[in-house]
């Protein structure tokens, strides 16, 4: 059988290294060797690259080497496949070396900010040594913040006569570390160099970008004062490296700036004790270069009616995220505050919050939450300076079987009946939503019976027991992940009824 006709011929000129062509099929059923016929020097010269011995056959590529690589030039290429049965020739293909030239990557030697120019980095590099001297090179600069996985790109060209191998990358974030990598190609070429070694640079520091501000309203104390826990953090989009030296807080009752109080702190939380009126609170952060824009919060009066607009909320899990979605009857509300914290028996150790804009869903990576912990999630609607009634739900990012089963006791033992009661498993040991309880009971040397009840039931009356018989019993609490048995108890039914 004749070899297959060589097709999909693809050639690339590795500048000052080789000119290599590849083709398909890559493997033939029978032993095949190949000849790549070439004309070069604009047709003046011809030669052949061949894989014509046993160690080099069946190899769908061939390379022409210096000094027979001329540039600029147009090459004509034809591939011949030969086996014991004959020869098959490809179509003739034509290659302009400028269009298929691949050069070495450039080398970035510095990425620096320029004194006094904000949000800019100047990249300096060395043009590849193995590149045509006179040609214009096109470049792609890739950059990302150091903690991001997503690259951004900018394209530009440099004439050789520039000899100015620098590029000013503008509109960056202040005081942020950026990773840079650069590739290049002759302007007419379809083949890019590889990417250069990555280099890191940091933009200049500025005054703080801004703050996100929130509060937790606590019940009024006996003396009528209201504790309000203020909390703030760097605004979304603020530089990762940004550090504040401190925070200034000032607050006053609405329409009464004469009663302004001020506080300075280096913490990101502060408890205020306010009266029953409406208050306005302002916070700024500052560093050696200046202050951030003011973050503002309105604390409603104690008796103020808050609006309610969230009608329903669902929490669902995807492969790697927890997604909370809600439905609202107020289309004008487009900002929401989400709070989440572990539902534990004691005071929660960690409290988190985040603003959501122009969406009615919120997502968090599963790995930011602890598995087997129940989280309380509340969503507050925010309309301008008003905060509405929250809607709350609970969620686990991963359920497990309970760490302990229910503690059980037998009450009201009768001749044929018994009432079983059990305690709720402590929150810290549930490891998931308890969806039901199963009571397993068995007479001595008898068959085991079971009864499953809803999770809101903590007591059950067993009937149709045998009089004067010893029973063993245990209750299993189940989550979606499975069940855990509680302690086993024993009881004996009475021989006669005791009134």
């Amino acid at each position: 059988v004749l070899p297959a006709k060589p097709e999909n011929i693809s050639c690339i000129f590795y500048y000052e290294e080789n000119f290599t062509c590849t083709w398909s099929p890559e493997k033939e059923a029978s032993y095949t060797w190949y000849k790549v016929k070439r004309t070069y020097s604009y047709g003046y010269k011809s030669d052949i690259c061949s894989t014509d011995n046993s160690t080099r056959g069946n190899h769908a590529s061939c390379s022409f080497l210096p000094p027979t690589i001329t540039n600029p030039d147009n090459y004509t290429i034809q591939v011949e496949a030969q086996n014991a049965d004959g020869i098959m020739k490809s179509d003739i293909t034509y290659w302009n070396l400028d269009a298929i030239m691949k050069i070495e990557p450039p080398e970035i030697f510095s990425v620096k900010s320029v004194l006094g120019i904000k949000r800019m980095l100047q990249i300096k590099w060395i043009r590849p040594v193995l590149a045509p001297h006179s040609s214009t090179l096109k470049y792609t600069l890739r950059f990302r913040t150091i903690n991001s996985a997503y690259w951004m790109e900018v394209n530009f060209t440099k004439e050789d006569i520039d000899r100015d191998e620098t590029y000013n990358l503008t509109e960056l974030q202040a005081f942020t570390e950026y990773v840079m990598t650069l590739r290049c190609a002759p302007a007419e070429s379809m083949f890019w160099s590889g990417w250069s070694q990555e280099k890191v640079g940091t933009t200049e520091e500025e005054a703080p970008y801004g703050l996100d501000l929130w509060r937790v309203l606590k019940p009024a104390m006996v003396d009528g004062r209201r504790p309000v826990q203020l909390m703030w953090k760097k605004a979304t989009g603020a530089p990762v490296l940004e550090k504040a030296l401190g925070y200034n807080i000032w607050y006053f009752p609405e329409n009464n700036t004469n009663l302004t109080e001020t506080v300075n702190t280096t913490n990101q939380t502060h408890e205020l004790y306010l009266g029953g009126k409406t208050y306005w609170v302002y916070v700024v952060s500052y560093n050696s270069l200046g202050e951030s824009p003011v973050a503002t919060l309105r604390i409603p009066a104690l008796n103020e009616k808050t609006f309610q607009c969230i009608e329903a909320m669902q929490a669902c899990l995807t492969q790697d995220q927890l997604v909370v979605e809600w439905q609202s009857s107020a289309p004008e509300v487009d900002t929401w505050m989400v709070e989440w914290f572990p539902d534990v028996d004691s005071e929660p150790s960690s409290f988190s919050w985040e603003s959501v804009s122009q969406a009615r869903n919120w997502t968090i990576q599963k790995d930011e939450l602890k598995p087997l912990w129940c989280y309380n999630i509340s969503v507050y609607p925010v309309l301008r300076d008003r905060v509405g009634q929250p809607y709350s739900t609970q969620a686990y990012v991963q359920e497990g079987i309970p760490s302990a089963g229910p503690v059980t006791q037998a009450d009201s033992i009768g001749v044929k009946t018994v009432t079983i009661t059990w305690k709720e498993i402590p929150k810290s040991k549930r490891n998931g939503f308890i969806k039901n309880y199963t009571i397993f009971y068995q007479a001595e040397d008898g068959k085991e019976f079971s009864k499953t009840v809803n999770s809101n039931i903590l007591q059950y009356r067993l009937e149709s027991l045998t009089r004067r018989t010893s029973y063993s019993l245990q209750v299993m609490a189940s989550t979606n992940a499975g069940g855990t048995n509680g302690t086993k108890i024993n009881f004996k039914t009475l021989s006669i009824s005791v009134l």
């Epitope: 003046y44 052949i48 690259c49 014509d52």
Partner: antibody, heavy 131, light 108 residues
């Protein structure tokens, strides 16, 4: 047997035209380059023109540039030399020659390389330009 | 164009004696593209040496070629009667292809 047979040589007046033909046999014609080489009476060899295996013109000697045209017809296994504006100094025996890929000693690396050289010559056809 | 100068223009050699012909190019020529031909009396030329030093099929090992850059040499280790004729060098490296003017070898 590899053979090259030239024809078309004749006596022609200066300024006249002539077309030389060279019919090849005994080899796969379109794998080879072809050249025309001439030899004036009692003189040395002069390369006139050539055409590569792909049908591209290799070039022309300065003395014939703009007057002579080389072409090939692979279907007929024939190479042509169209000669216009002939001059007395074009008088010569015109040889048709085959350019074959010959392997140079192993140059190292993963592949073998062949370069094209004139390895077969025809018997020649005489062109005389005279008034 | 590249001018190829051969020396000597004629050479008379006794049978069994060595002979040497020089070919000098007016500019550098790749050794891949330097060729030697022999034209015996009344015949078409024939290929002797290609790529400066590779012998063509059927050529006696009495013939050898060497050189690089602008200087190339053809040597006949022991001249025989059948070696008479005109020897030409040719360069393929630069357009147009050019021949030397020829060296006539005869037997003493």
């Amino acid at each position: 047997e590899v053979q090259l047979v030239e024809s078309g040589g004749d006596l022609v007046k200066p300024g006249g035209s002539l077309r030389l033909s060279c019919v090849a046999s005994g080899f796969t014609f379109d794998d080879y380059g072809m050249s025309w080489v001439r030899q004036a009476p009692g003189k040395g060899l002069q390369w006139v023109s050539g055409i590569n295996w792909a049908g591209g013109t290799i070039g022309y000697a300065d003395a014939v540039k703009g007057r002579f045209t080389i072409s090939r017809d692979n279907a007929r296994n024939t190479v042509y030399l169209q000669m216009n504006s002939l001059r007395a100094e074009d008088t010569a025996v015109y040889y048709c020659a085959r350019e074959s890929p010959l392997r140079l000693g192993d140059l190292g690396g993963d592949y073998f390389y062949y370069y094209y050289y004139i390895d077969v010559w025809g018997q020649g056809t005489l062109v005389t330009v005279s008034s | 164009e590249v001018v190829m100068i051969q020396t000597p223009l004629s050479l008379s050699v006794s049978p069994g004696e060595p002979a040497s012909i020089s070919c000098r190019a007016s500019q550098s020529v790749s050794s891949r593209y330097l060729v030697w031909y022999l034209q015996k009396p009344g015949q078409s030329p024939q290929l002797l040496i290609y790529g400066t030093s590779s012998r063509a099929t059927g050529v006696s090992d009495r013939f050898s070629g060497s050189g690089s850059g602008t200087d190339f040499t053809l040597r006949i280790s022991r001249v025989e009667a059948e070696d008479v004729g005109v020897y030409y060098c040719q360069q393929y490296d630069n357009a147009p292809r050019t021949f030397g003017q020829g060296t006539k070898v005869e037997i003493k």
